[in-house]
Interface confidence: low
């Protein structure tokens, strides 16, 4: 006789989300032998990078690779050191390299090749670390949430594949500098560009996506903060009572507040502004963000992009999820209707700085832009992609699903790792009854 | 209330070892990690690293890497560092500081909110 | 790694007195944090996430700043403010802390 050697256990993949304002490090898992089957890939762990994201390290670019080394230091004790040299790991950049490619494409590069630097000296399978576009990101958190969900292809106790009748989700995703909106649409796309045909376990799907950059939390935060000092002595979604010194620089330096930014200032100025509590100035603010006045198709969303009505079930996930969450759990409003959403928005735009303060004890940093954040929210998802009363009740808040983080991360890996087939599996598990 | 006790003050020669305790109390020890950091007289602060109690997870400054080694013993709610193969330039006062965090837009933001009293190792010969 | 530079090395102050604490970053850093030690004590945190009040800290303290540049303000400087200010950030690894300005009450 001669020794069988088993199969591995489980199989790992590592990818490094590296978004606007952190980089986060995902660890997955699934069992060797059921690489086709769907929703086997979990989270098995994961990281945040202290800090800011890599793109805020464009003056310090081996900084950028040497942030990373905390998390690849837990990689190393997560993932067995017998899989370590088959374990493939990514890095896939967003919004915020995306804008710094468009500023200052030398330092883009310089960081991703110090981050690529500092991931080779690890004893992972590197497979590359590059910047997604808006689309890849839209579609990836698509493909993730729908993956988790097992909303592609389910396997029946006759041993059969089949695919559910229930449909798949929609996701939108809001980061740091850019928001995503992913859907399965029946109609055909005016624009090209917001197309994207998929064959996943030989069923084929067509989906609409759009990724609004500039408009993640952050990026709209200051835009904002650029419209209130460019409009007014003081900033209406700030609580009456608060009040910081902003430096000149600091807004201006981003391209996603260029329309606001003066011919000339001095960037190492700082500029006293406080709060007033005034939700109705604060929802004229938000809703100078989005334009309506031209649309060269049959419909839009917003500034000119077409998009289909919205179709089906959405599920809301990072930003959008921590906003309302704060909304639901600290504050404790009701946010089940547009409505409701809308009413919330106002409420926590009327408090002052000490009501706040008292509402949400020991979670006072950033305290402050809670008011905008939700007003964003509620403009995006009404006026913004025309979700009515009847459509809202579709969308879930959710940042997680089968215990696995919500993002475009994992829809990436599978796809990179071949995890999800085009065709269905030419062999059917266990046992026909038939 | 919220406490760090840590063992006495050391004095070792070169090349020898030492391990240093920091017992919590006040709170649940396996919610927050717990960090080492270094002051030599007249030099600033040092992080030398932290642990998460929960998952006996560890990192390290690269300075620090094979100089100290960190642990944790749950059942007695006590983070350990130990310091080998000592010199001089290692006498200092050694802290641990449970690290707190405020969770924002789902990104957790960590400072040192309580300190231990501080051990001084002395290195001399 | 980042280095934190704190300005003065040194300051006097008299008690009522209004005094600035300075930090400076060699590259941007998101957010930093401000710990006080007294001798023969452990730091003790101050302000977090650059201009938070830790718990049971007074009024008269407060910090701002952003990018590479922060500081640290005492509106009216009392006598049990005598003590070394350290700065500390949380945004690059590994983290890093200030030399440290220590105040000196008249």
């Known amino acids: 006789t001669r020794d069988i050697r088993e199969p591995p256990a489980l199989k790992y993949g590592i990818v490094l989300d590296a978004g606007s304002s952190h980089t986060s490090m995902f660890i997955y898992k699934w069992p060797a032998d059921k690489e086709n089957d769907t929703g086997i890939v979990g989270q098995h762990s994961s990281c945040d990078v202290p800090g800011g994201g890599i793109s805020s390290y464009a003056d310090n670019p081996s900084g950028a690779g040497q942030s990373l080394v905390g998390c690849l230091e837990q990689a190393l004790r997560d993932v067995p050191k017998e899989r370590h040299a088959g374990t493939p790991l990514y890095l896939g950049a967003t919004a915020g390299m995306r804008l710094l490619n468009l500023t200052n494409p030398e330092a883009s590069t310089s960081v991703l090749t110090a981050v690529t630097h500092t991931l080779t000296q690890y004893p992972f399978d590197f497979r590359g670390a590059r910047i997604l576009s808006g689309q890849e990101e839209g579609v990836f958190g698509w493909v993730t949430a729908n993956y988790l969900l097992e909303n592609f292809i389910k396997y029946g106790w006759v041993g059969r594949w089949f695919r559910p009748r229930k449909g798949t989700l929609g996701a939108m995703d809001l980061g740091g500098a850019s928001t995503q909106i992913t859907f399965e649409t029946t109609s055909p796309a005016e624009d090209r560009a917001s197309e994207v045909q998929l064959r996943l376990y030989g069923q084929h799907y067509r989906v609409y996506t759009h990724s609004f950059l500039c408009y993640g939390r952050d990026q709209v935060l200051q835009r904002l903060l650029a419209s209130a000092l460019q409009t007014h002595s003081f900033h209406p979604c700030w609580p009456r009572g608060f009040s910081t010194h902003v430096l000149l620089g600091d807004v201006y330096q981003s391209p996603c507040t260029v329309a606001q930014r003066p011919q000339t200032f001095n960037s190492s100025a700082r500029v006293s502004l406080s709060g007033s509590s005034d939700p109705h100035l604060c929802r004229d603010l938000v809703s100078g963000l989005f334009s309506f006045s031209s649309c060269p198709f049959s419909r839009c969303s917003f500034n000119g992009v077409f998009q289909p009505p919205v179709a089906g079930n959405f599920i809301a996930f990072s930003a959008f999820f921590y906003t309302v969450n704060f909304l639901r759990t600290s504050m404790g409003l009701p946010v089940a209707t547009l409505q409701q959403l809308e009413a919330a928005a106002v409420n926590v735009c009327n408090q002052t700085w000490a009501q706040l303060q008292a509402r949400v004890p020991g979670q006072q940093a950033h305290l402050a832009d809670y008011c905008a954040g939700a007003m964003f929210v509620q403009q995006l998802l009404s006026r913004g992609y025309g979700f009515d009363e009847r459509a809202f009740g579709g969308v879930i808040f959710q940042k997680k699903a089968a215990d696995t983080a919500v993002g475009w991360a994992l829809g990436y890996m599978l796809n990179l790792t071949n995890l999800i087939p085009a065709d269905p599996p030419g062999l059917r598990k266990g046992t026909d009854f038939s | 209330q919220v406490q760090l006790v840590q063992s006495g003050a050391e004095v070792v020669k070169p090349g020898a070892s030492v391990k240093i305790s920091c017992k919590a109390s006040?709170?649940?020890?396996?919610?927050?990690?717990m960090d080492w950091v270094k002051q030599a007289p007249g030099q600033r602060l040092e992080w030398i690293g932290d642990?998460?109690?929960?998952?006996?997870?560890?990192t390290y400054n690269q300075q620090f890497k094979g100089k100290a080694t960190i642990t944790v013993d749950k059942s007695a709610s006590t983070a350990y560092m130990e310091l080998s193969s000592l010199r001089s330039e290692d006498t200092a006062v050694y802290y641990c500081?449970?690290?707190?965090?405020?969770?924002?837009?789902?990104?957790?933001?960590?400072?040192?909110?309580?300190w231990g009293q501080g051990t001084l190792v002395t290195v001399s010969s | 790694e980042i280095v934190l530079t704190q300005s003065p090395a040194t300051l006097s102050a008299s008690p009522g007195e209004e005094i600035t604490l300075s930090c400076s970053a060699s590259?941007?850093?998101?957010?930093i944090h401000w710990y006080q030690q007294k001798p023969g004590q452990a730091p003790r945190l101050l302000i977090y996430?650059?201009?938070n009040l830790a718990s049971g800290i007074p009024a008269r303290f407060s910090g701002s700043g952003s990018g590479t540049f922060y500081t640290l303000t005492i509106s009216s400087v009392e006598p049990e403010d005598a003590a070394v200010y350290y700065c500390?950030?949380?945004?690059?690894?590994?983290?890093?802390f200030g030399g440290g300005t220590k105040l000196e009450i008249k």
């Open positions: 500390h950030q949380w945004s690059s690894y590994p983290w890093t």
């Open positions: 996430s650059t201009s």
């Open positions: 590259s941007s850093v998101s957010y």
């Open positions: 500081a449970r690290r707190g965090f405020f969770l924002y837009y789902g990104i957790n933001y960590y400072y040192f909110d309580v």
């Open positions: 006040g709170y649940t020890f396996t919610d927050y990690n």
């Open positions: 642990i998460n109690p929960k998952y006996d997870i560890s």
